[in-house]
């Protein structure tokens, strides 16, 4: 028996369902009573879901997995993982035994988009050219860790005096806080871009200082 899985990682958004595809080619006359199908975590071999001795033996993994029972006889051994969590990320092995056996691993990459950044300034009043100002760009509930880029109004990258921190919450999602310290010119626009490297999703925030008062561009 030959087991086939997708070579590319499966990317799943947090709280959505994911299908880990796995298939085999049944011989003529194949019956489910002959099938041993086991999904397990590749690294630890912890059982995830199994179908053996003609029976679906259920989810051993947070009760969030299911097979496609009507498709098994056609060689579809795919696993449905419901309500994906950050902790589900990793490699899963599909093990199929009929007379002989084969196995293959599929990777699950979990992702969550970052929120539109909110921008704050300190100090936020009585600003004059030459003042040192701290601009904070905050974006929430993303996964995996973000890449953060700052630019000025001319699109020139700002790399000095940037401090970025990323903290995971209890669900494993990251809140990003990036702080830029700059000396104000007469006018200035400062943009922050928070990129999710898996989703290739960019979230933008900016603040414009035009003398007095400060203005924030309207939300897109």
């Amino acid at each position: 028996v030959e087991v086939q899985v997708s070579e590319d990682p499966v990317v799943a958004l947090v709280d959505t369902d994911a299908t880990l595809r796995c298939s085999f080619s049944p011989e003529p006359g194949f019956s489910l009573a002959q099938l041993n199908l086991i999904w397990q975590l590749t690294d630890t071999k912890q059982l995830v879901h199994s179908f053996t001795e003609g029976r679906d033996q259920g989810s051993a993994y947070s009760n969030r997995t299911a097979l496609f029972p009507d498709l098994l006889v056609q060689g579809n051994a795919s696993l449905r993982l419901q309500r994906v969590r950050v902790t589900d990320e990793g490699s899963y092995t599909c093990f199929v035994s009929i007379q002989d056996f084969d196995s293959a691993a599929v990777s699950l990459q979990v992702a969550a988009p970052y929120s539109k950044p909110s921008m704050t300034l300190e100090p936020n009043k009585d600003l004059r050219p030459g003042n040192m100002v701290t601009i904070t760009c905050s974006s929430y509930q993303g996964y995996p860790e973000a890449e953060v880029f700052w630019k000025d109004g001319q699109g020139v990258p700002l790399t000095g005096n940037v401090t970025t921190s990323q903290m995971a919450n209890e669900r494993g999602l990251f809140d990003v806080h990036s702080v830029l310290r700059v000396v104000l010119g007469a006018n200035g626009t400062y943009s922050c871009l928070v990129r999710n490297p898996v989703l290739q999703q960019d979230a933008h925030g900016s603040v414009t200082i035009t003398g007095q008062p400060l203005t924030f561009p309207p939300e897109a």
């Epitope: 053996t52 001795e53 029976r55 093990f95 196995s103």
Partner: antibody
Framework: QVQLVQSGAEVVKPGASVKVSCKAS????????MHWVKQAPGQGLEWIGM????????NYNERFKTRVTITVDKSTSTAYMELSSLRSEDTAVYYC??????????WGQGTLLTVSS | DIQLTQSPSFLSASVGDRVTITCSAS?????MYWYQQKPGKSPKLLIY???NLASGVPSRFSGSGSGTEYTLTISSLQPEDFATYYC?????????FGQGTKLEIK
């Protein structure tokens, strides 16, 4: 015919570890789940965990997860259950049992483990 | 975990009696399995998939039920039937057993 023959009785001290064996014969060892079940003196049956010899997949009861390791040696058709950090409450008969569909259809004769100082 | 509660826990009966043991599950299960255990012996599978007799088990044993309520019936007790009986489920992990029903001679 299916036979599961377990290792003999053990007397061990608290804090130690023990490894019980279960030698299978009369069937294709790699095709069936092997379970381990605990029965304390005068008590009922408690599932410890299981392993599939072919893939090595295992699943443990959360109550035992931190102290139990179930393994197999395919070359000798033998399953093992190792229990660590033993305490008096671990005194019990331990059974290996082969799956039959969703049941445990064939059982070993049991291994009495006594934890005593 | 799915809890299985057997009733009664103890049962006194005479040879020839019809006895019924009930197993109630805390959540719905697909199938129930029944075992017999005699003192100093390993458990023996009696009934699989709720109602199917395991190989070599006399036809006086029968099982029925669905959802959360299952029963084991012995139609006419024989002397060799006095033992402890356990129900078990594998619809959900961990696998669980009932606490047992001890069947004694009256």
């Amino acid at each position: 015919q299916v036979q599961l023959v377990q290792s003999g009785a053990e007397v061990v001290k608290p804090g130690a570890s023990v490894k019980v064996s279960c030698k299978a014969s009369g069937y294709t060892f790699t095709n069936y789940w092997m379970h381990w079940v605990k029965q304390a003196p005068g008590q009922g049956l408690e599932w410890i965990g299981m392993i599939h010899p072919n893939s090595g997949a295992f699943n443990y009861n959360e109550r035992f997860k931190t102290r139990v390791t179930i393994t197999v040696d395919k070359s000798t058709s033998t399953a093992y259950m190792e229990l660590s950090s033993l305490r008096s409450e671990d005194t019990a008969v331990y059974y290996c049992a082969r799956s039959t569909a969703l049941a445990t259809g064939y059982w070993g004769q049991g291994t009495l483990l006594t934890v005593s100082s | 975990d799915i809890q299985l509660t057997q009733s009664p826990s103890f049962l006194s009966a005479s040879v020839g009696d019809r006895v019924t043991i009930t197993c109630s599950a805390s959540s719905s299960v697909s199938y129930m399995y029944w075992y017999q255990q005699k003192p100093g012996k390993s458990p023996k599978l009696l009934i699989y998939d709720t109602s199917n007799l395991a190989s070599g088990v006399p036809s006086r044993f029968s099982g029925s039920g669905s959802g959360t309520e299952y029963t084991l019936t012995i139609s006419s007790l024989q002397p060799e039937d006095f033992a402890t009986y356990y129900c078990q489920q594998w619809s959900s992990y961990p696998l669980t057993f009932g606490q047992g029903t001890k069947l004694e001679i009256k």
